[in-house]
């Protein structure tokens, strides 16, 4: 009977092992070992045993010891099991962005490693084990599917192999892949909310606000705002899970007409868009024309109001008849019309919305000078020593200068409080003079002496 020791060996790939072959008889006719492995007999042996060193063991092998004794021939095999850790443990790349709520498939490839029966493949989130499977096939491929939530954003996923040869080898051999960081995102199915003027006047500034709620991670979201070909430069305000992009927009005459306002919110590999129509319009203030802005009294004046061809005007609150962009009326200028305002209001409908403009012109009426009995009485009778204020008002545009003189030298103190004396008595010639000419009027002052009272 032939014996071999050790009957089983677990050794690292490329390692060496000493194997003892022995015969049951004292003087075997022959004793040896058959193996394809490089072997070296370790001397000295014994009468019925030999020690061999097998080196560079690359794969599992079963070297055979044989002996030839008088009672017959026999053999025995030792089982050499080679172990080695995988040459490649690799987690397949994760998508650049993974939507929240969608399952993620993790895939790990393992090349090499033996014995396979003792090799386990694990998929990990951080240090938490998600799945544990045995390695099958070459290369071995292991997959698992996990649901993805917001809390998985920034989490590291990896793949680890465990070669467990205990109790034969006290050590547990681990190989871990390079970690992959997951970027998750949540972009709601609702489009952004866009608040903007529906109509915008050329050369005026408008404000556009685009907002969206339920974003994650909000800091990674990008906003694009554009009106036609004009890219807007918004100021973005971030909330917990929301953002608001505010931009000023100024439009030129070239953009007149209907333009598309577009707001796009991009997160991960997805975009949510909202489009809105903005009508760009030009609406100059209406023109108020007077045949002459300055006329003499009695002159006929045509007041005309003209606006945008599609506008409807009202002149001093009276609508054009028929309603349209032009209104006019004729008036004979009177002094009362001096400083009179003529207001033209225009209403333009732009895409169903009403916009308004105003223009006002003032008429100057030249008249006078005038000295009327009402404003410059021809007779005053005052008691002597009483306090009186002589009044005489000249009218006209331009405003006339007024002088009242007695005998060409003594002035009547118009508008001043005076003590009535005998000197005040007499006839005064009041003269109102302007660039338009002069008028005169006699004013008599009578003084009542106390003896007549």
């Amino acid at each position: 009977q032939t014996s071999v020791f050790p009957p089983e060996v677990i050794l690292p790939r490329g390692g060496s092992v000493k194997v003892n072959c022995s015969a049951s008889c004292d003087q075997p006719i022959s004793l040896g070992m058959e193996t394809p492995l490089p072997k070296k007999e370790i001397l000295p042996g014994g009468n019925n045993w030999k020690m061999y060193e097998l080196s560079n063991v690359q794969e599992d092998s079963q070297p055979m010891c044989y002996s030839n004794c008088p009672d017959g021939q026999s053999s025995a095999k030792t089982l050499l099991t080679v172990y080695w850790t995988p040459e490649r443990v690799e987690l397949a790349p994760l998508p650049p962005w993974q939507p929240v709520g969608k399952n993620l498939t993790l895939r790990c490839q393992v090349e090499g490693g033996a014995p396979r029966a003792n090799l386990t493949v694990m998929l990990l989130r951080g240090e938490k084990e998600l799945s544990r499977q045995s390695a099958v096939g070459e290369p071995a491929e292991v997959t698992t599917t996990v649901p993805v939530g917001r809390d998985d954003h920034g989490a590291n996923f990896s793949c680890r192999t465990e070669l467990d040869l205990r109790p034969y080898v006290l050590k547990l051999f681990e190989n871990t892949s390079a970690p992959h960081q997951l970027q998750t995102f949540d972009l709601p199915a609702t489009p952004p909310q866009l608040v903007s003027p529906q109509v915008l006047e050329v050369d005026t500034q408008g404000t556009v606000v685009c907002s969206l709620d339920g974003l994650f991670p909000v800091s990674e979201a990008q906003v694009s705002l554009a009106l036609g070909d004009q890219k807007l430069n918004p100021t973005i305000t971030y909330g917990n899970n929301s953002l608001s992009a505010k931009a000023s927009v100024k439009v030129t005459a070239e953009e007149e007409g209907t333009q598309q306002l577009l707001c796009g919110v991009m997160l991960g590999n997805q975009t949510q868009e909202t489009r809105q129509t903005v009508t760009i319009y030009s609406f100059p203030a209406p023109n108020v024309n007077l045949t002459k802005p300055e006329v003499s009294e009695g002159t006929e004046v045509i007041v005309e109001c003209e606006a945008h061809p599609r506008a409807k005007v009202m002149l001093n609150g009276v609508p054009a008849q028929p309603p349209g962009p032009r209104a006019q009326f004729l008036l004979k200028a009177t002094p009362e019309d001096n400083g009179r305002s003529f207001s033209c209001s225009a209403t333009l409908e732009v895409a169903g919305q009403l916009v308004h403009k105003n223009q006002t012109r003032e008429l100057r009426v030249l008249y006078g000078p005038r000295l009327d009995e009402k404003d410059c009485p021809g007779n005053w009778t005052w008691p002597e020593n009483s306090q009186q204020t002589p009044m005489c008002q000249a009218w006209g545009n331009p405003l006339p200068q007024l002088k009242c003189l007695k005998d060409g030298t003594f002035p009547l103190p118009i508008g001043q409080s005076v003590t009535v004396t005998r000197d005040l008595e007499g006839t005064y010639l009041c003269q109102a003079r302007s660039t338009r000419g002069e008028v005169t009027r006699e004013v008599t002052v009578n003084v009542l002496s106390p003896r007549y009272e």
Epitope: Q198, M314, G317, P322, C344, T347, G352, Q353, L354
Partner: antibody, heavy 122, light 110 residues
Framework: QSVEESGGRLVTPGTPLTLTCTAS????????MSWVRQAPGKGLEWIGI?????STYYASWAKGRFTISKTSTTVDLKITSPTTEDTATYFC???????????????????WGPGTLVTVSA | GYDMTQTPASVEVAVGGTVTIKCQAS??????LAWFQHKPGQPPKRLIY???TLASGVSSRFKGSGSGTQFTLTISGVESADAATYYC????????????FGGGTEVVVK
């Protein structure tokens, strides 16, 4: 001055129907005209408007479902493909006025017709 | 657009009492607001225009106020004939997709 709707009747779903609003005592070339409806148990709903020059605007829900057009004396509302949800009383209203103090025109439904009933049923 | 939010949706009032109905516009409509009374089987009746001007033939018990975005209709000395649905309506825009009327307020007179 008055407006009156006509053309309301019982129709089957999908059968186009045209309602007519006839204006008396004022010229449609000077006014905007709106169509408004009230479905049973619902509030007043503005459908759309036609301007003095013939431009039309519609409520978002009404776009594609209704067409407004006009002649010199009438304004038409065509229900292109009626559904049971279009069962309602349809009103036409003059929708244009002005304010002398500001000198501005504005939308103002100052004159209404008595309404016409449309019933859509299979 | 100009969304018109009307509150309350329904209100109950005793004869002789006072009712206040509010209407809020999502953007300023200056004073271009009208109030309508609507009874079943009749066309709507315009009560107030330009936010506070009483339409001809309308009782002075109806009063409109407000400007910009906040408007109020007050009915004082309520009568049984005032039982109806009341609507506010903006006169600022009739753009495509516009909201013209508020949601309505049902006034029930006890």
């Amino acid at each position: 001055q008055s407006v009156e709707e006509s053309g309301g009747r019982l129709v089957t779903p999908g059968t186009p129907l045209t309602l007519t609003c006839t204006a008396s005592g004022f010229s449609l070339s000077n006014y905007y005209m709106s169509w408004v409806r009230q479905a049973p148990g619902k509030g007043l709903e503005w459908i759309g408007i036609i301007s003095d020059s013939g431009s039309t605007y519609y409520a978002s829900w009404a776009k594609g479902r209704f067409t407004i057009s006009k002649t010199s004396t009438t304004v038409d509302l065509k229900i292109t493909s009626p559904t049971t949800e279009d069962t309602a009383t349809y009103f036409c209203a003059r929708d244009w006025s002005y304010d002398s103090s500001s000198g501005y025109y504005y939308y103002d439904m100052d004159l209404w017709g008595p309404g016409t009933l449309v019933t859509v049923s299979a | 657009g100009y969304d018109m939010t009307q509150t309350p949706a329904s209100v109950e009032v005793a004869v002789g009492g006072t009712v206040t109905i509010k209407c809020q516009a999502s953007q300023s409509i200056n004073s271009w607001l009208a109030w309508f009374q609507h009874k079943p089987g009749q066309p709507p009746k315009r009560l107030i225009y330009k936010a506070s001007t009483l339409a001809s033939g309308v009782s002075s018990r109806f009063k409109g106020s407000g400007s910009g975005t906040q408007f109020t209709l007050t009915i004082s000395g309520v009568e049984s004939a005032d039982a109806a649905t009341y609507y506010c309506q903006q006169g600022y825009s009739r753009s495509d997709g516009e909201h013209v009327f508020g949601g309505g307020t049902e006034v029930v007179v006890k």
